[in-house]
Interface confidence: low
C-alpha cells in the first residue's frame, strides 16, 4: 500500500520507495552480506525503508539489489530519481584499495512481473552514479544525512514493465529513496480546448502533436492543437474554440450567461446585458425577450433595444382646394425608439347623411408624392369628387408596427370638397308637344358637384341657328316652354348651375310644334 506524496502535475509516479508502508522486500544478491534493508527516521520522525551496503574493506565486491517489477503504463521513457548517501573514502581509514565512491544503475525490460532471480547478464547499464557536491542535509535525530539526488532517464521502453537494479562494487551507500516516474503533459484547457493527459514521446527531443476537444458549450473556430514536449510542458498552442451562443468564458469554461444577460453568437465576446426593454429569465439566453408591448423587427440585431410602434402623428392640418386636399402633420411624440418611421395615407369617402358609412376612395384618387411609405409629413391628394365628405387617416408606422395587434397610431381629419360646376345633363326629353308649347323634362347631372341652384333652358328656331335664342330658368327638372310658333322646328339645350357656376349644355333636342290643336306626347330626344 502506498501513501500519497505530492509531486509535480506533469510527473506520474510508477514507484516511490518512500510511500511503501512496511518492508520493501526487494531481491538482493548475494542474499547475505550485501545490500540490507534498514529502517531509519527522516526529519519528521517518520520511518524510511532504506537499502544500505558498506563492504569497503573487502575487494572485488559485486552486490546487486533489484526492485520489484515496475509497470510502464504506456510510457516510452521513464525517469529514475535516486536519493542516497555515499561516504567519502577519505573518511574511512585503511580502505584505499578497496573503497569505491560510485555505484551502477541498471534496468531490464520484461513482460514477466514475477521473476525471482537476478540474472546479471539480462540487465542493461543506465549509468554509473557518483555523489556530487549538490547534497541536502537532513537531520535524522543525532546525525545529519548528506542526501544526494541524481536523476537518470531510460527509453524507449516497449515491454509491459521493467526491473531496476543497483550494483555496488565496494562503496558505503544508503539508498534513501528510489522514485520511478514518467512525464506527461497534464490535462489542460487552453483557448477553451481541453487537451488530455498526454505521455511524452520516446526521446528527449520529441514533440507529440495532440488535438484538443472543445470544452462543453463551445465549438471549434480553428482546429485546436498543441505539442507535448519531452519535459511534460505544453508548447505552441494552435487554433481555438469559441463559447457557443448563450455562453461566455469564465475560468477557462464556457458558462451560461446569467439571468438578465445574453449572447447571440459563437464568439469570444462576453455575455451582454439585455438591451433596453428586454429581459431573459433563464440562464444561457441567446437573445432577450422583449418586454410586453415592445418588439424586435426581423432584421434588428439581438443587441438592439426592443422598440415600439410609434404613437399617432400630431397636428394634422387640411387645406381643401376644390377637388384637391393638402394634408400636413407633425411627427409623433413617441417614435417608439426607432429611426425607420414612415406614414401611410388612408382615404375614405363618406356619405353626408351617415358619416359612419365610409368606403375606400378607390384608384381614381392620386397622391403626391405617394400614398404609402411617406418619409415627409405632407401629402397632396387630387382627383377627388367635388362636394363630397372624405375622411383621411394618417398612420405612423415603423419596423415593428406589424407586430402590434392593437394599432392606435393614426390621426384623422374629415373634409368636404368644394362645390364645382356640375357635369352636363345626359338626357333631355320632350314630354308634351302642342301647336304653341313643348313640355320638357331632364335628369340631374351625373356629377352635380354641389347643390343644384337652377337649370337654364336655351331654345331657338332651328333655321335661326342660334342667332336669336331665348332663355328660361327653373329650379325644377322640367318646364313648359310656351309662346312657340306652330309647325316650327325648335332646338332645346339644358344646363345646370351650382354656386360654382354653370355646367355645359346638354346635347341639342330638336322638337317641331304641331299644326293641329291636338297634343302629341313624346319621350324621345328628337321629337317631331
Amino acid at each position: 500500500v502506498t501513501g500519497s506524496r505530492v509531486y509535480p502535475a506533469n510527473e506520474v509516479t510508477l514507484l516511490d520507495s518512500r510511500s511503501v508502508q512496511g518492508e520493501l522486500g526487494w531481491i538482493a544478491s548475494p542474499l547475505e552480506g550485501g545490500w540490507e534493508e534498514v529502517s531509519i527516521m527522516d526529519e519528521k520522525n517518520t520511518p524510511i525503508r532504506t537499502y544500505q551496503v558498506c563492504n569497503v574493506m573487502e575487494p572485488s565486491q559485486n552486490n546487486w539489489l533489484r526492485t520489484d517489477w515496475i509497470t510502464r503504463e504506456g510510457a516510452q521513457r521513464v525517469y529514475i530519481e535516486i536519493k542516497f548517501t555515499l561516504r567519502d573514502c577519505n573518511s574511512l581509514p585503511g580502505v584505499m584499495g578497496t573503497c569505491k565512491e560510485t555505484f551502477n544503475l541498471y534496468y531490464y525490460e520484461s513482460d514477466n512481473d514475477k521473476e525471482r532471480f537476478i540474472r546479471e547478464n539480462q540487465f542493461v547499464k543506465i549509468d554509473t552514479i557518483a555523489a556530487d557536491e549538490s547534497f541536502t542535509q537532513v537531520d535524522i535525530g543525532d546525525r545529519i544525512m548528506k542526501l544526494n539526488t541524481e536523476i537518470r532517464d531510460v527509453g524507449p521502453l516497449s515491454k509491459k514493465g521493467f526491473y531496476l537494479a543497483f550494483q555496488d562494487v565496494g562503496a558505503c551507500i544508503a539508498l534513501v529513496s528510489v522514485r520511478v516516474f514518467y512525464k506527461k503533459c497534464p490535462l489542460t484547457v487552453r483557448n477553451l480546448a481541453q487537451f488530455p493527459d498526454t505521455i511524452t514521446g520516446a526521446d528527449t527531443s520529441s514533440l507529440v502533436e495532440v488535438r484538443g476537444s472543445c470544452v462543453n458549450n463551445s465549438e471549434e473556430k480553428d482546429v485546436p492543437k498543441m505539442y507535448c514536449g519531452a519535459d511534460g510542458e505544453w508548447l505552441v498552442p494552435i487554433g481555438n474554440c469559441l463559447c457557443n451562443a448563450g455562453h461566455e468564458e469564465r475560468s477557462g469554461e464556457c458558462q451560461a450567461c446569467k439571468i438578465g444577460y445574453y449572447k447571440a453568437l459563437s464568439t469570444d465576446a462576453t455575455c451582454a446585458k439585455c438591451p433596453p426593454h428586454s429581459y431573459s429569465v433563464w440562464e444561457g439566453a441567446t437573445s432577450c425577450t422583449c418586454d410586453r408591448g415592445f418588439f424586435r423587427a426581423d432584421n434588428d440585431a439581438a443587441s438592439m433595444p426592443c422598440t415600439r410602434p410609434p404613437s399617432a402623428p400630431l397636428n394634422l392640418i387640411s387645406n381643401v382646394n376644390e377637388t384637391s386636399v393638402n394634408l400636413e402633420w407633425s411627427s409623433p411624440q413617441n417614435t417608439g425608439g426607432r429611426q425607420d418611421i414612415s406614414y401611410n395615407v388612408v382615404c375614405k369617402k363618406c356619405g353626408a347623411g351617415d358619416p359612419s358609412k365610409c368606403r375606400p376612395c378607390g384608384s381614381g384618387v392620386h397622391y403626391t408624392p405617394q400614398q404609402n411609405g411617406l418619409k415627409t409629413t405632407k401629402v397632396s391628394i387630387t382627383d377627388l369628387l367635388a362636394h363630397t365628405n372624405y375622411t383621411f387617416e394618417i398612420w405612423a408606422v415603423n419596423g415593428v408596427s406589424k407586430y402590434n395587434p392593437n394599432p392606435d397610431q393614426s390621426v384623422s381629419v374629415t373634409v368636404t370638397t368644394n362645390q364645382a360646376a356640375p357635369s352636363s345633363i345626359a338626357l333631355v326629353q320632350a314630354k308634351e308637344v302642342t301647336r304653341y308649347s313643348v313640355a320638357l323634362a331632364w335628369l340631374e347631372p351625373d356629377r352635380p358637384n354641389g347643390v343644384i341652384l337652377e337649370y337654364e333652358v336655351k331654345y331657338y328656331e332651328k333655321d335661326q341657328n342660334e342667332r336669336s335664342y331665348r332663355i328660361v330658368r327653373t329650379a325644377a327638372r322640367n318646364t313648359d316652354i310656351k309662346g312657340l310658333n306652330p309647325l316650327t322646328s325648335y332646338v332645346f339645350h339644358v344646363r345646370a348651375r351650382t354656386a360654382a357656376g354653370y355646367g355645359d349644355f346638354s346635347e341639342p333636342l330638336e322638337v317641331t310644334t304641331n299644326t293641329v290643336p291636338s297634343r302629341i306626347i313624346g319621350d324621345g330626344a328628337n321629337s317631331t
Epitope: 446569467k258 439571468i259 438578465g260 426593454h277 429581459y279 418586454d291 410586453r292
Partner: antibody
Framework: QVQLVQSGSELKKPGASVKVSCKAS????????MHWVRQAPGQGLKWMGW????????TYADDFKGRFVFSLDTSVSTAYLQISSLKAEDTAVYYC?????????????????WGQGTTVTVSS | DIQMTQSPSSLSASVGDRVTITCRAS??????LAWYQQKPGKAPQLLLY???NLADGVPSRFSGSGSGTDYTLTISSLQPEDFATYYC?????????FGQGTKVEIK
C-alpha cells in the same frame, strides 16, 4: 388591493383527489406567474413549481411530478392545484404565491404576495 | 440542486436584542436570495429580496447582507412582533429551495 384568496380546508381519504383554488384580484392576472409552495406540519417550505398564466404551461419540481397538476381559468383569474391519489404524506398547507411574468430591469425574483394557505388533511 | 442551510435552527432572544440569522448556499447564488417571515397559522411575508433590498412596508430594523454563498439577515433591535420563523430562499436555477427555517423565540 392585491390579493390571492385560496379555497378552504379539505379533509380527504387516501386515494381521493383534491383541487385547491387560488383567486387573484387587484392586478392583471396574466402579468404574474403563479407558484405553489407546500408546508408539511411542523416543517419548512418547499417550492412545488409554477404555471405560466399567459400560456398555461406548467413546470413541476422533481418531487411533484406525476400526481400534481397546475391549471388555470384566466376568465376568473384563478389558478388551481389538483392532487390525485392522495397519500397521508400529502397532508400539508399549500400556498400559492406570485412572481412577475415579465421583467423590466430587475433580475432578482421574489414572492411578493402569498395566498393565505389551504390545509389539506389526508386521513382514513 | 442547490441546498440552503440556515443557522441557527432556533434562538431565544429578548426585546431590544440584535439578532443575526445566516443562510449558506451550496454554490454561488449571486445574491439571488429572499428572506421571509412566517408567524404561526399565517402565510410567509417577504422581508428582503436580492439579499439586501428591503421589501415595501418592512421596518428598517431588518437588513440583509452577503454575496456568493453566505448571506445574513439581521434584526437590529428585536420587537415583540418579530418573534416568528424566518426562511431564506434562493432563486438561482430551479428548484428554488428554502432554508429549513430559524425560529426566533422569547427568552
Amino acid at each position: 388591493q392585491v390579493q390571492l384568496v385560496q379555497s378552504g380546508s379539505e379533509l380527504k381519504k387516501p386515494g381521493a383527489s383534491v383541487k385547491v383554488s387560488c383567486k387573484a384580484s387587484g392586478y392583471t392576472f396574466t402579468d404574474y406567474s403563479m407558484h405553489w409552495v407546500r408546508q408539511a406540519p411542523g416543517q419548512g417550505l418547499k417550492w412545488m413549481g409554477w404555471i405560466n398564466t399567459e400560456t398555461g404551461e406548467p413546470t413541476y419540481a422533481d418531487d411533484f411530478k406525476g400526481r400534481f397538476v397546475f391549471s388555470l381559468d384566466t376568465s376568473v383569474s384563478t389558478a388551481y392545484l389538483q392532487i390525485s391519489s392522495l397519500k397521508a404524506e400529502d397532508t400539508a398547507v399549500y400556498y400559492c404565491a406570485r412572481i412577475p411574468l415579465y421583467y423590466y430591469g430587475s433580475r432578482y425574483w421574489y414572492f411578493d404576495v402569498w395566498g393565505q394557505g389551504t390545509t389539506v388533511t389526508v386521513s382514513s | 440542486d442547490i441546498q440552503m442551510t440556515q443557522s441557527p435552527s432556533s434562538l431565544s432572544a429578548s426585546v431590544g436584542d440584535r439578532v443575526t440569522i445566516t443562510c449558506r448556499a451550496s454554490e454561488n447564488i449571486y445574491r439571488n436570495l429572499a428572506w421571509y417571515q412566517q408567524k404561526p397559522g399565517k402565510a410567509p411575508q417577504l422581508l428582503l429580496y436580492a439579499a439586501t433590498n428591503l421589501a415595501d412596508g418592512v421596518p428598517s430594523r431588518f437588513s440583509g447582507s452577503g454575496s456568493g454563498t453566505d448571506y445574513t439577515l439581521t434584526i437590529s433591535s428585536l420587537q415583540p412582533e418579530d418573534f416568528a420563523t424566518y426562511y431564506c430562499q434562493h432563486f438561482w436555477g430551479t428548484p428554488w429551495t428554502f432554508g429549513q427555517g430559524t425560529k426566533v423565540e422569547i427568552k
